[in-house]
Amino acid sequence: SIPWNLERITPPRYRADEYQPPDGGSLVEVYLLDTSIQSDHREIEGRVMVTDFENVPEEDGTRFHRQASKCDSHGTHLAGVVSGRDAGVAKGASMRSLRVLNCQGKGTVSGTLIGLEFIRKSQLVQPVGPLVVLLPLAGGYSRVLNAACQRLARAGVVLVTAAGNFRDDACLYSPASAPEVITVGATNAQDQPVTLGTLGTNFGRCVDLFAPGEDIIGASSDCSTCFVSQSGTSQAAAHVAGIAAMMLSAEPELTLAELRQRLIHFSAKDVINEAWFPEDQRVLTPNLVAALPPSTHGAGWQLFCRTVWSAHSGPTRMATAVARCAPDEELLSCSSFSRSGKRRGERMEAQGGKLVCRAHNAFGGEGVYAIARCCLLPQANCSVHTAPPAEASMGTRVHCHQQGHVLTGCSSHWEVEDLGTHKPPVLRPRGQPNQCVGHREASIHASCCHAPGLECKVKEHGIPAPQEQVTVACEEGWTLTGCSALPGTSHVLGAYAVDNTCVVRSRDVSTTGSTSEGAVTAVAICCRSRHLAQASQELQ
Amino acid sequence: QEDEDGDYEELVLALRSEEDGLAEAPEHGTTATFHRCAKDPWRLPGTYVVVLKEETHLSQSERTARRLQAQAARRGYLTKILHVFHGLLPGFLVKMSGDLLELALKLPHVDYIEEDSSVFAQ
């Protein structure tokens, strides 16, 4: 007797109706920028305050007939999904609605900007608890809308947006493409991406996670007790806004970076059938379906990390791609990936006082991606140690020599176009876990971090015969911070982290032949923080 | 989620610093840029968000808007300032002819200008 979507976001060992407390999210205010709403609907009556903000364009067409229930349809449903008494995620959250979409569901970038400004001014005039802003709308890529979202996020507001319903790369739309915004794609009851007519949910690296977005039962503006099923990435975003409200109510001091990491951490992993996405987008699209955390108290003891993909570099010879972490996150490792296999590796470098991950395309390559591993590591002091290409045949190596610093990631980058297939693989000497080893013609970069109680270990998985994919995962209680391939295997396309698993991809086996250099070794660096664990035990 | 995405159209209009002899001409070498939606049916030409440089104060935003109106009027164009932004981004929303873009891009403090566009319920 509970809608499928509420069941889906509830941790398996809880009954959804018992787990979702009637006051869940009560310390949080959720702003909804959408159509007008029917605020006296039973689901939301008394919990949604309609502000006097309205900035909408005229409806199209001379024969358009304004019907109140149609004008309110989208916004009422979403308000119900966020905080509805019966079908809502955060049943205790209070909401404020701003009208930025007209009766046809259309608005403008400028109207949305003015709405965001209104929220910021309200926040300054009357500071309340944590704020979540739900933007269940999308337009074409907009520099100004993304900039406004960035400013609001940096003022401590959590913004959640729809990825878009265009069955396209979410990076081509705003505010979905704004890095500071939590961008949500839609899945159905079978955990498959939602199809909407000929289109469907957007996808790609600009999507943070997915959430239920098909056949979502919620408040209907047709009558004060009516319900209706609606579908779309707006509905998915509303679920995440509700989950965010629940999390922030339990831990009001959470930063945006902490909240995003928790949303990712508590999501259901690898349940989406990636075949639905275009082939080139599968690796970039997170296979995550949002869920509530298994308990309402904090998970501060965990070392949280996420993977951030860059935009594609483009095919020019000297093209590079840059992946960045959020301001509150530490870049703990950097890797690269190229579908053609032609790349010149990656390096961590300082940019504006912060480390970024830069990947380099090679001559004849179709382009590369940089992949950053971004983690929450309080009181961390991280630096990059670089060893230039070695003359010796043993290869290049670099280690963390500072006292108390541990190795969190290895990168290698080379100037030569091809490291050559004739050179044998270089293996790491045993018993030296704090060391990165690379090809003698490559410069090697070690990410070395000092943080209270931080400990890391290296885990390898080698396969002698050629394989398209080699993986190695960190065990329970450890978090993957670094992912790389042992050098010497020239057919490696790159390495990247998927949740807690390091994935090393190779060229199609049939084209490489099974020579000795078919051997592929995936190297994972797994870390944990004893300090965070102790701190959370003391709190409990 | 960078600004590098390919489908995003950017028009860079070069400055001709001798025109208008502005008292507060932009620093040498900086070029304000014009942006518009890559999806043509979603464009709303005639309304523009003029975004000013980060540290611009409200009074400077209002002054820049008035200056644009005055210079447009001298050329026989009517403009309407629909909103002055402050709190999140400095700038203003203006209803004007696209013919004035080159002029607007040369105004002091201007970082970039974006043509308004549609957003849709998802």
Epitope: S1, I217, T225 | -
Partner: antibody, heavy 126, light 106 residues
């Protein structure tokens, strides 16, 4: 099958508080599919909806009675209750409790009242 | 508040005859209207919901029609057990009931 039974005093003095309880048998009150409502009918007159509650304790009331009504739920006893304060002779009526489909679970049926209790007459008199 | 006006207040008919009851809303209730039957000393029973759908176990002689502000309950051929009071109820905006129509034996 599901049955509802109203109970409470049949006589209440003016300005006092009317208190009634509805006991649900043959099914659990704990379901998102239903609200549990109170409806009254003054002698020889029509029906008037008073208010409803779900098992989580979320209430909604008739705007004209809102200031005087409190509905509560006790899931452990499978009961819900009505309190109507500051009563007058105009509150004399047969009070019914009824199940109302919430509409959240489409399979549970349409969003209307039924089944009903058999009703209890409450007279307000000094 | 949406006011529902039922007419006639009383309808005197013989068994086997056709009964037509009217319910008019003060503003549109779309199709969110139900009909209940109440016999003396009993609780109301749902007959028709959402203007035209028969509730479970209700005989086919009962039918509902209308939308917006004007609704009709028709009993095609009155049976002895059909003589009772009939109420309409809307849920477009909260819940209100009509004043009732009494169908009595002529």
């Amino acid at each position: 099958q599901l049955q509802l039974q109203e109970s409470g005093p049949g006589l209440v003095k003016p300005s006092e508080t009317l208190s009634l309880t509805c006991t649900v048998s043959g099914g659990s009150i704990r379901s998102s599919a239903y609200y549990w409502g109170w409806i009254r009918q003054p002698p020889g007159k029509g029906l008037e909806w008073i208010g409803s509650i779900n098992y989580r304790g979320s209430t909604y009331y008739n705007p004209s009675l809102k200031s005087r009504v409190t509905i509560s739920v006790d899931t452990s006893k499978n009961q819900f209750s009505l309190k109507l304060s500051s009563v007058t002779a105009a509150d004399t009526a047969v009070y019914y409790c009824a199940r109302e489909n919430s509409g959240v679970v489409p399979a549970a049926g349409p969003n209307w009242f039924g089944p009903w209790g058999q009703g209890t007459l409450v007279t307000v008199s000094s | 508040e949406i006011v529902l006006t039922q007419s006639p207040a009383t309808l005197s008919l013989s068994p086997g005859e056709r009964a037509t009851l009217s319910c008019r809303a003060s503003q549109s209730v779309s199709s969110y209207l139900a009909w209940y039957q109440q016999k003396p000393g009993q609780a109301p029973r749902l007959l028709i919901y959402d203007a035209s759908n028969r509730a479970t176990g209700i005989p086919a002689r009962f039918s509902g029609s209308g939308s917006g502000t004007d609704f009709t309950l028709t009993i095609s051929s009155l049976e002895p057990e059909d003589f009772a009071v009939y109420y309409c109820q809307q849920r477009r905006n909260w819940f209100t009931f009509g004043g009732g129509t009494k169908v009595e034996i002529k």
